[in-house]
């Protein structure tokens, strides 16, 4: 039975030209992290594998970063980059959890964090 | 030991499909991903495309976008290529690798597609 | 796409003697989270697929003998032979993958002089 909940940053929002972090903790569950994917819609933006460490896409090289922790970080962000962002947690023996994030990204220099939120 | 084999040569007509197969063993198939590069007779080496068996990602040359399909099946470790609408410029060794991300570190043997009418 | 333009096409070392092959991308390779250099260096022989030599620019892959070796960063590269062995001549590829399509050199064929 999967017990865990996945804790995301939830909304976002972030100045144009500016980076954000985007994190998810898995908690709740005493199974074993293996992979964690970043997905934007359905691209692959990073894997951090337990055993391989931490794979980026090519396409994303110039704006991704691996990091803080098993979260990302997007930079020279555009309008663009507005959307759904996807954190999915390989386990074992529970199987796949996944966050979900939602970022905004804003011309104005008015760009507040949302609240957190919990996804089970 | 980490080992790809690759399915035999094949002789093919122009117009048809090819479907070369390449087989992991020695590793966990789901971690890495599986690249396809091909070489003409005499020529350099062309990255096809890749594919990771542990998600849906693949990712393709756009040369061959919309002739190159890469699937992975992971209940036999294996990856496959198919290429249509063959011409005689598809004549080639096409080679499978193994990818992370310091390099492609495992190639397979290769398998030689033929076109000829 | 990145282009890898190698040099020289073709190179004849006596056995004993320093062999050096040039790689230029036409773009920066260098990852700017972990400096380092997404660079390879192959080596092909006849009928055999290519093997690898060095990664991420200057680090020697497992069994690759000592005398290979891998320097530069971002668009200029040199794959080094420091005493050319019979064993060694063999066709010689870089290629980037920093940003798909990955891309190879058009080969440099090492030669006995």
């Known amino acids: 039975m999967m017990t865990g909940t996945i804790e995301t940053t939830g909304n976002i929002s972030a100045e144009k030209g500016g980076s954000i972090i985007l994190q998810c903790h898995l908690s709740s569950t005493t199974a074993q992290v293996t992979q964690v994917n970043w997905e934007q819609q359905d691209q692959l933006l990073a894997i951090c594998n337990a055993d391989l460490g931490w794979h980026i896409s090519p396409s994303f090289k110039d704006r991704v970063a691996p990091g803080p922790g098993l979260g990302l970080t997007l930079q020279s962000l555009t309008v663009n980059d507005t959307g759904e962002y996807f954190c999915i947690y390989h386990t074992y023996p529970d199987g796949t959890y996944t966050g979900r994030i939602f970022l905004e990204v804003l011309e104005s220099s008015v760009a507040e964090h949302g609240a957190r939120f919990q996804i089970p | 030991q980490v080992q790809l084999v690759q399915s035999g040569a094949e002789v093919k007509k122009p117009g048809a499909s090819v479907k070369v197969s390449c087989k992991a063993s020695?590793?966990?198939?789901?971690?890495?991903?599986i690249h396809w590069v091909r070489q003409a007779p005499g020529q350099g080496l062309e990255w096809i495309g890749d594919i990771y068996p542990g998600g849906r990602y693949s990712n393709y040359n756009e040369k061959f976008r919309g002739r190159v399909t890469l699937t992975a099946d992971t209940s036999t470790s294996t990856v496959y290529m198919e290429l249509s609408s063959l011409t005689s410029e598809d004549t080639a060794v096409y080679y499978c690798a193994r990818y992370y991300e310091s390099a492609m570190d495992f190639w397979g043997q290769g398998t030689t597609v033929t076109v000829s009418s | 796409d990145i282009v890898m333009t190698q040099s020289p096409d073709s190179l004849a070392v006596s056995l004993g003697e320093r062999a050096t092959i040039n790689c230029k991308s036409s773009q920066n390779l260098l990852y700017n989270s972990n400096q380092k250099s997404y660079l390879a260096w192959f080596q092909q022989k006849p009928g055999q697929p290519p093997k690898l030599l060095i990664y991420w620019a200057s680090t020697r892959e497992s069994g690759v003998p000592d005398r290979f070796s891998g320097s530069g960063s971002g668009t200029d590269f040199t794959l080094t032979i420091s005493s050319l062995q019979a064993e060694d001549l063999a066709v010689y590829y870089c290629q980037q993958y920093y940003n798909y399509p990955f891309t190879f050199g058009a080969g440099t064929k090492l030669e006995l002089k």
């Open positions: 020695g590793y966990t198939f789901t971690n890495y991903w």
